[in-house]
């Protein structure tokens, strides 16, 4: 009786169970009454990452520098190239097909999480007692200056964008 299902790492063709090609190899010829499956290694800059019956290997991803991309991990016959973005840029998607400049946090906002090659800057509003007076992709919200510790008094209150202004205490004559 010809099989209707095959074992793991096999496939059914012409009523026969043929071995799949291992990762890094492509199918040339299905197995026959006389021969095992014929597989060939993927060429330079090609890969297949699963047990397969593909007749063509996939091309490695190209990390296009014009799109701000660079190689994070070189591809092998069994793995695709992994791209990441140049310093100061991050991927626009999980597949990392292009990059955009890291977002800066506006005055009044500080960096909660610094951007990576794959994630953008995360900003947070500066809470009471903190400020940020610059547009930056790195700066956190800074605490207002403590006038008291400098033996000074607050002359101008701080905001989320400005520090407090300290001044000398009025001397009682």
């Amino acid at each position: 009786e010809p099989p209707t299902a095959c074992r793991e790492k096999q496939y059914l063709i012409n009523s026969q169970c043929c071995s799949l090609c291992q990762p890094g190899q492509k199918l040339v010829s299905d197995c026959t009454e006389f021969t095992e499956t014929e597989c060939l290694p993927c060429g330079e800059s090609e890969f297949l990452d699963t047990w397969n019956r593909e007749t063509h290997c996939h091309q490695h991803k190209y990390c296009d520098p014009n799109l701000g991309l660079r190689v994070q991990q070189k591809g092998t016959s069994e793995t695709d190239t992994i791209c990441t973005c140049e310093e100061g840029w991050h991927c626009t998607s999980e597949a990392c097909e292009s990059c955009v400049l890291h977002r800066s946090c506006s005055p009044g906002f500080g960096v909660k999480q610094i951007a990576t090659g794959v994630s953008d800057t995360i900003c947070e509003p500066c809470p009471v007692g903190f400020f940020s007076n610059v547009s930056s992709a790195f700066e956190k919200c800074h605490p207002w200056t403590s006038c008291e510790t400098k033996d000074l008094v607050v002359q101008q209150a701080g905001t989320n964008k400005t520090d407090v202004v300290c001044g000398p205490q009025d001397r009682l004559r």
Epitope: V28, S29, T32, E33, F34, T55
Partner: antibody
Framework: QVQLQESGPGLVKPSETLSITCTVS????????VYWIRQPPGKGPEWMGM???????DYSTSLKSRLTISKDTSKSQVSLKMSSLTAADTAVYYC???????WGQGTLVTVSS | DIVMTQSPLSLPVTPGQPASISCRSS???????????LHWYLQKPGQSPRLLIY???NRFSGVPDRFSGSGSGTDFTLKISRVEAEDVGVYYC?????????FGGGTKLEIK
């Protein structure tokens, strides 16, 4: 449908080189392997060698030194070349696809002066 | 090279009677992937060999079910349950597990 057809010289002189072409139709030589069998008159078949779909070759141990198998996929042809012929090489030569039971009709080659 | 030894060399059989041909290989014919590439052919006078059984026990399409194959490792058998007149010819075993592929010397089946 699948067909294989050998074309040979018929008569070859001793010490000369034999060239036979197997022209196939109904399938691509890049996806199927083809092997050569010969059968001397009144004797059993002998496997000579094969051309794999991927382009590699395997040869009979006894014939390896004087046998070359090649293919031209675009022309759908597999060629057999065998040098230094003797009378012992007189046989019917067949090309065969490595699946099912697809044989050429065979070509008789006689080695004689 | 793998040597294939067939017996008997000649097999006279009465029509309707069973017949059995033995084939022994000098090495195991089990492949690294677990397949055993042992085949049986019948060659009738003036014709090319015709595939009967492939991979030990699989009947090729169109082959009558009176033909069966069995065996493993190095010992194999072709059985004909009830011989018919049209079964006459030379039977060859062949292996394609190891390169070079090789044939047995043949068994001539004739009708008594």
């Amino acid at each position: 449908q699948v067909q294989l057809q050998e074309s040979g010289p018929g008569l070859v002189k001793p010490s000369e080189t034999l060239s036979i072409t197997c022209t196939v139709s109904g399938f691509s030589l890049s996806r199927y392997s083809v092997y050569w069998i010969r059968q001397p008159p009144g004797k059993g078949p002998e496997w000579m060698g094969m051309m794999w779909g991927g382009g590699s070759t395997d040869y009979s141990t006894s014939l390896k030194s004087r046998l070359t198998i090649s293919k031209d996929t675009s022309k759908s042809q597999v060629s057999l070349k065998m040098s230094s012929l003797t009378a012992a090489d007189t046989a019917v030569y067949y090309c065969v696809r490595t699946d099912g039971d697809y044989w050429g009709q065979g070509t008789l080659v006689t080695v004689s002066s | 090279d793998i040597v294939m030894t067939q017996s008997p060399l000649s097999l006279p059989v009465t029509p309707g009677q069973p017949a059995s041909i033995s084939c022994r290989s000098s090495q195991s014919l089990a492949s690294s992937q677990g397949n055993t590439y042992l085949h049986w052919y019948l060659q009738k006078p003036g014709q090319s060999p015709r595939l009967l059984i492939y991979k030990v026990s699989n009947r090729f399409s169109g082959v009558p079910d009176r033909f069966s194959g069995s065996g493993s490792g190095t010992d194999f058998t072709l059985k004909i349950s009830r011989v018919e007149a049209e079964d006459v010819g030379v039977y060859y075993c062949s292996q394609s597990t190891h390169v070079p592929w090789t044939f047995g010397g043949g068994t001539k089946l004739e009708i008594k």
